[in-house]
């Protein structure tokens, strides 16, 4: 049964979608694989704190070490990067606490950007001066292991020289690696000494080996590639927004809530009401009133603002967020002060630091 | 892992009700929406309604407010679905579905016959 | 409601050819939309969401693309595991609607 009573009839018109969504992220934890991650739960007060990823709940096993308010992966690799959360239950409440960990080398081998200008990889040797292949640029080649999120683009490069000036051909997983080993192909590109993949997928994952060779040798280097995959959640809500705010009678004010969803967020605010002097129904469940929410005649529903206050305005304001998902809901308090109270401060103070005048 | 686990099959009365049943495990039920589809025999796939366990939100088909009442405990991690005034044309499979629609319950299938 | 119109109804396809199914929503949808496959019997299985993703050990000749209103379901080279009806649905905006189905055969 739901946890509360409306006020009023709140039936919501049709929302329009909108074309893109206000996106905050979490807090992002990067860690390479193989590394070792050590995340605080920023809450406070906790009796009991219980830890998810992906929704689904996290123990303790032989690289995940739970201990108090701290989650520890030991060794870290790609298919722990996700959305982690942990609850503090305590005795009248629970309160939960989202980050991102990204497990992951940089998406390319080398700067995605400085294909514009690939000649300093690209050696010309005296004629005379025969030569075996060699690497000219092993920097570009330190990273071996590149765990990507699916949909992005990957380049593995291997800037040689030569003379003469040597060939480059690329294996997958030992074998040599066609066009028509995967939708959409690749692209090499000599001048740069790079294999391009664009929008990578999980059966992209494997050993990508390229070979230079010329008549006087052959060299070759090996990346190993592991495609992440990304999974849709319910909403994230920005720690610590909306935030508490105060002004005085006859003031304005504005509670903001960010919202992170990759799948339509319906955003509500929400106020705890009386009716008939009661705050709460006969069912025992608090009254509440939907104050604002997303939809066609709805500009910038995370942002609430309050216009001349009076004391009733006073209380606490719930932001709720909804997908097809599910929900998240984070709330603050409005305390209106007496205009005597803050002399010559009647302008807003806003609810959060981005808005402050 | 994750399971849905619904009720078994039901023959009912013009008329009467039915309740469904949909056991979550394998995943912490609070945290996700829980849908109701239907799907009549031959015919495609109809959202009946959802429920969002942790504070009993639920949000329902036009097609079907006022006949179906979806509720959750959250103590057995189990969702319902009850639907009133049963007629001939309810006959269907009733799947529930964890809210990211990636787990499916093996589906419940209500015949309504006099 | 969002009214999601699906085509073809059914079609016939031999091992090996690239099927496309099309789903168009009568109001845009952003990318709000999955992609599902149902074979005889069974529930659903969610093979595509956010119009794009492939949900997690989904082979790779699935795919989809498009925003708004018009969305595109590919399988690149149909193998004999594929026969099934495939649905598209739009979770944007309650009710969430289902376009009607597109049964797939092989020749």
């Known amino acids: 049964r739901p946890s509360f009573s409306l006020v009023e009839d709140t039936t919501l018109e049709p929302e329009e979608p909108p074309t893109k969504y206000q996106i905050s992220q979490p807090e992002v934890y990067v860690a390479a694989p193989g590394e070792s991650l050590e995340v605080r739960c920023l809450l406070k007060d906790a009796a009991v704190i219980s830890w998810t990823k992906d929704g689904v709940h996290l123990g303790p096993n032989n690289r995940t070490v739970l201990i108090g308010e701290y989650l520890q992966i030991k060794g870290a690799t790609p298919r722990d990067s996700g959305l982690y959360a942990c609850t503090a239950s305590r005795t009248v409440d629970s309160e939960t606490w989202y980050f991102m960990v990204n497990v992951t080398d940089a998406i390319s081998s080398g700067d995605d950007e400085d294909d514009t200008d690939g000649a300093e990889d690209f050696v010309s040797e005296n004629s005379n001066n025969k030569r075996a292949p060699y690497w000219t640029n092993t920097e570009k080649m330190e990273k071996r292991l590149h765990a990507v999120p699916a949909a992005n683009t990957v380049k593995f490069r291997c800037p040689a020289g030569g003379n003469p000036m040597p060939t480059m051909r690329w294996l997958k997983n030992g074998k040599e690696f066609k066009q028509e080993h995967r939708i959409g192909g690749y692209k090499v590109r000599n001048q740069h000494w790079s294999l391009i993949m664009e929008s990578v997928v999980p059966s992209d994952k494997g050993n990508y080996t390229c070979v230079v060779e010329n008549e006087y040798g052959s060299i070759n280097h090996t990346y190993h590639l592991d495609v992440v995959e990304r999974s849709p959640h319910r909403p994230i809500l920005q720690a610590g927004l909306p935030a508490n705010a105060s002004t005085v009678v006859g003031g304005d004010v504005e509670f903001v809530c960010k919202v992170y969803s990759d799948a339509q967020p319906h955003i509500q605010w929400i106020k705890h009401v009386e009716k008939n002097g009661s705050k709460y129904g006969p069912d025992g469940l608090p009254y509440l009133k939907v104050l604002k929410h997303s939809g066609i005649n709805s500009s910038n529903a995370e942002v609430l603002a309050l216009f001349n206050v009076t004391e009733a305005d006073a209380g606490e304001y719930i932001c709720k967020v909804s997908n097809y998902i599910g929900q998240a809901n984070q709330s603050a308090w409005l305390t209106v002060l007496p205009k005597q109270q803050a002399p010559g401060r009647e302008k807003e103070i806003t609810a959060s630091p981005d808005y402050l005048e | 892992q994750v399971q849905l686990v619904q009720s078994g099959a039901e023959v009912k009365k013009p008329g009467s009700s039915v309740k469904v049943s949909c056991k979550a495990s394998?995943?912490?039920?609070?945290?996700?929406?829980v849908h109701w589809v239907r799907q009549a025999p031959g015919q495609g796939l109809e959202w009946i309604g959802s429920?969002?366990?942790?504070?009993?939100?639920?949000t329902y088909n036009q097609n079907y407010r006022g006949r179906a009442t979806i509720t959750a405990d959250k103590s057995t991690s189990t969702a319902y679905m009850e639907l009133s005034s049963l007629r001939s044309e309810d006959t269907a499979v009733y799947y529930c579905?964890?809210?990211?629609?990636?787990?499916w319950g093996q589906g419940t299938l209500v015949t309504v016959s006099s | 409601d969002i009214q999601m119109t699906q085509s073809p109804s059914s079609l016939s396809a031999s091992v090996g050819d690239r099927v496309t199914i099309t789903c168009k929503g009568s109001?845009?949808?952003?990318?709000?939309i999955a992609w599902y496959q149902q074979k005889p019997g069974k529930a659903p299985k969610l093979l595509i969401y956010?119009?794009?993703y492939r949900y997690s050990g989904v082979p790779s000749r699935f795919s989809g693309s498009g925003s708004g209103t018009d969305f595109t379901f590919t399988i690149s080279s149909l193998q004999p595991e594929d026969i099934a009806t495939y649905y598209c649905q739009q979770h944007s905006t309650t009710p969430y609607t289902f376009g009607q189905g597109t049964k797939l055969e092989i020749k």
């Open positions: 429920i969002y366990p942790d504070n009993g939100d639920s």
């Open positions: 579905a964890r809210g990211d629609f990636a787990y």
């Open positions: 394998g995943y912490i039920f609070t945290s996700y929406n």
């Open positions: 956010s119009a794009s």
């Open positions: 109001n845009g949808v952003s990318n709000d």
